[in-house]
Amino acid sequence: HKCDITLQEIIKTLNSLTEQKTLCTELTVTDIFAASKNTTEKETFCRAATVLRQFYSHHEKDTRCLGATAQQFHRHKQLIRFLKRLDRNLWGLAGLNSCPVKEANQSTLENFLERLKTIMREKYSKCSS
């Protein structure tokens, strides 16, 4: 079957996100991938969106993330825009209104995005073949 345009958008956004490091990409998020054996694909997308939403809601105007220079501030704003787009697209792909995120495990945002990118690329390779 045809790859969803949203999936392509997600991969492009993840590529952009993982290329850039900011003051906040080393901060931690809930690692939903640590124990996702019995989780459906849609639940995984929904939970990933929830984690991203929690992150940017908490850190959007966080002074630690805003930085001391204009360039750091600009990069942080771009990071937030990318995260919001990613959240929006994952939520659309999931088609679920809400999903619990209860894991205790943590990972850095950077590692979380890399793991998500791997999952999305695998999904893309399956649907495009």
Epitope: R81, K84, R88, G92
Partner: antibody, heavy 120, light 107 residues
Framework: QVQLVESGGGVVQPGRSLRLSCAAS????????MHWVRQAPGKGLEWVAV????????YYADSVKGRFTTSRDNSKNTLYLQMNSLRAEDTAVYYC?????????????WGQGTMVTVSS | AIQLTQSPSSLSASVGDRVTITCRTS??????LAWYQQNPGKAPKLLIY???SLESGVPSRFSGSGSGTDFTLTISSLQPEDFATYYC?????????FGQGTRLEIK
């Protein structure tokens, strides 16, 4: 100061083409998605198109799909809208707009607009 | 495409009044909604994004609320410069769409 300036509007006959330009200053164009929004005389706002910050994605309103193309030259800090097969219903003020600083696909900086009149 | 319905389409009020404009979407968009103000012959101006976040430089008398399908823009105490047309816009998915507008006039 952050600014967008459109140009290229005018009167054109139905079926003809026109290219609008939008010159950006005061910010790095390559960091932002850019949109075109239009407003017919006495009417509301209608979104026309978006091009992602790096030019990798473009989306269009159904009303212009296949006729309009947006492009960008980040080295010249300029956005373009190529309008082909123009129709009377394309008559409007055309605005270019920058995506929001904190959210994608909202418009925090707008140009002053350029009027396009399609008439025989 | 997601449709947006604003109400009322026009509204008469006086300086100092509290005014509320509503925007309803044809499907759930969580908080992916923005509000704009437009004066005649001018470009629109962003007021609110993410349903309730106030854009930098916008007076605090403007506020937004809601999520899902029902949203409101409130002006707590109307000032003379607030008489204009207001638009809501969804950015949950392409195509981006606007409400039909609410014209706010002096009573």
């Amino acid at each position: 100061q952050v600014q967008l300036v459109e140009s290229g509007g005018g009167v054109v006959q139905p079926g003809r083409s026109l290219r609008l330009s939008c010159a950006a200053s005061g910010f790095t164009l390559s960091s932002f998605g850019m949109h075109w929004v239009r407003q017919a005389p006495g009417k509301g706002l209608e979104w026309v198109a978006v091009i992602w910050y790096d030019g990798s994605n473009e989306y269009y309103a159904d009303s212009v799909k296949g006729r309009f193309t947006t492009s960008r030259d980040n080295s010249k800090n300029t956005l373009y809208l190529q309008m082909n097969s123009l129709r009377a219903e394309d008559t409007a003020v055309y605005y270019c707009a920058r995506e929001g600083s904190w959210s994608p696909d909202i418009f925090d900086i707008w140009g002053q607009g350029t009027m396009v009149t399609v008439s025989s | 495409a997601i449709q947006l319905t604003q109400s009322p389409s026009s509204l008469s009020a006086s300086v100092g009044d509290r005014v509320t404009i509503t925007c309803r979407t044809s499907q759930g968009i969580r908080s992916a909604l923005a509000w704009y103000q437009q004066n005649p012959g001018k470009a629109p101006k962003l007021l609110i994004y993410d349903a309730s976040s106030l854009e930098s430089g916008v007076p605090s008398r403007f506020s937004g609320s809601g999520s899902g399908t029902d949203f409101t823009l409130t002006i707590s105490s109307l000032q003379p410069e607030d008489f204009a047309t207001y638009y809501c816009q969804q950015f949950n998915s392409y195509p981006v769409t606007f409400g039909q507008g609410t014209r706010l006039e002096i009573k």
